[in-house]
């Protein structure tokens, strides 16, 4: 059975959209009108991983690009990056752990916890135009809640 995927955009709880910032970075900023076309479309793939109550393991690729969000240690700190992959082999059911996020969906709010680094979440800053990053705190200044908008294939 092939891996199932859906296309979507993500906005943080302050309604900031995610856009490309250079070849291997995402940033979050408020967009309006035609500028909304700049936001990245993700291909969210449902992969096998550790399951619990409200967690679904997913991989977040950029639609029609061979780039996936991944979590790696840089200078001993869990770090979010965009990683290039061989499009012939991805997505797949058995994604390497650095590509896997536990999607936690409660009341239409989503969090994305790194499977590689538990309690580290895809995060955005309160400030405009700042990089999307992996944050180790929830409920603080940084934003870890997102909403998902489905995009037709």
């Amino acid at each position: 059975a092939p891996v199932r995927s859906l296309n979507c955009t993500l906005r943080d709880s302050q309604q900031k959209s995610l856009v490309m910032s250079g070849p291997y970075e995402l940033k979050a900023l408020h967009l309006q009108g035609q500028d909304m076309e700049q936001q990245v479309v993700f291909s969210m793939s449902f992969v096998q991983g550790e399951e619990s109550n409200d967690k679904i393991p997913v991989a977040l690729g950029l639609k029609e690009k061979n780039l996936y969000l991944s979590c790696v240690l840089k200078d001993d700190k869990p770090t979010l990056q965009l990683e290039s992959v061989d499009p012939k082999n991805y997505p797949k059911k058995k994604m390497e752990k650095r590509f896997v996020f536990n999607k936690i969906e409660i009341n239409n709010k989503l969090e994305f916890e790194s499977a590689q680094f538990p309690n580290w979440y895809i995060s955005t800053s309160q400030a405009e135009n700042m990089p999307v990053f992996l944050g180790g705190t929830k409920g603080g200044q940084d934003i870890t809640d997102f909403t998902m908008q489905f995009v037709s294939s």
């Epitope: 449902f46 096998q48 393991p57 058995k94």
Partner: antibody, heavy 118, light 106 residues
């Protein structure tokens, strides 16, 4: 925590339609990526997967039973319903529902035994 | 469909023994394979997925290996609570299960 519970008649007559209900808690079938499967096990025999319904109402059926099975969901009630038409004594089994976030089955109900007999 | 063949169908062993159960798929399933434990009157319990990944909470004496068509489940040192029936399941195609291996106390 995640719980699932199957309910349905204990006894059904041959040729009748069997309706089974899975009521679950601890997760929502409106959550993207979520699915619920039905699996059965005749007494003393192996497990057999029957059907699966995904959060987006995509449905999958066992090819050998597809013509007799219908799976549906009521997201607001946290229920999944399986109907099997034209039952036969060989359909006697314990019927389980299980949460399937696609591949293996991490959470199961306790099962409900259904006997098909005249 | 993909047939799963388990062997042996039954096995007698003692507490402390090392036990191996094998499962063969009728076609290549890569590592799309899970193992379950079932006790009488109970639902199956997921032990291993991806052929070798231990499900959370499962004791480390359980291990799985293999890829393609041949797989094994090993219990390194049998405990009294391990006597049960074990099933393999592939999910490369629509799910199918093996016929089970009943592990009994010698």
């Amino acid at each position: 925590q995640v719980t699932l519970k199957e309910s349905g008649p204990a006894l059904v007559k041959p040729t009748q339609t069997l309706t089974l209900t899975c009521t679950f808690s601890g997760f929502s079938l409106s959550t993207s990526g979520m699915g619920v499967s039905w699996i059965r096990q005749p007494p003393g025999k192996a497990l057999e997967w029957l059907a699966l319904i995904y959060w987006d109402d995509d449905k999958r059926y066992s090819p050998s039973l597809k013509s007799r099975l219908t799976i549906s969901k009521d997201t607001s009630k946290n229920q999944v319903v399986l109907t099997i038409t034209n039952v036969d004594p060989v359909d006697t089994a314990t019927y389980y529902c299980a949460r399937s976030a696609y591949y293996s089955f991490a959470y199961w109900g306790q099962g409900t035994l259904v006997s098909v007999s005249a | 469909d993909i047939q799963m063949t388990q062997s042996p169908s039954s096995l007698s062993a003692s507490v402390g023994d090392r036990v191996t159960i094998t499962c063969r798929a009728s076609q290549d399933v890569d590592t799309d394979l899970a193992w379950y434990q079932q006790k009488p009157g109970k639902a199956p319990k997921l032990l291993i997925y991806w052929a070798s990944t231990l499900q959370s909470g499962v004791p480390s004496r359980f291990s799985g290996s293999g890829s393609g068509t041949d797989f094994t489940l090993t219990i390194s040192s049998l405990q009294p609570e391990d006597f049960a029936t074990y099933y393999c399941q592939q999910y490369s195609s629509y799910p199918t299960f093996g016929a089970g291996t009943k592990l009994e106390l010698k």
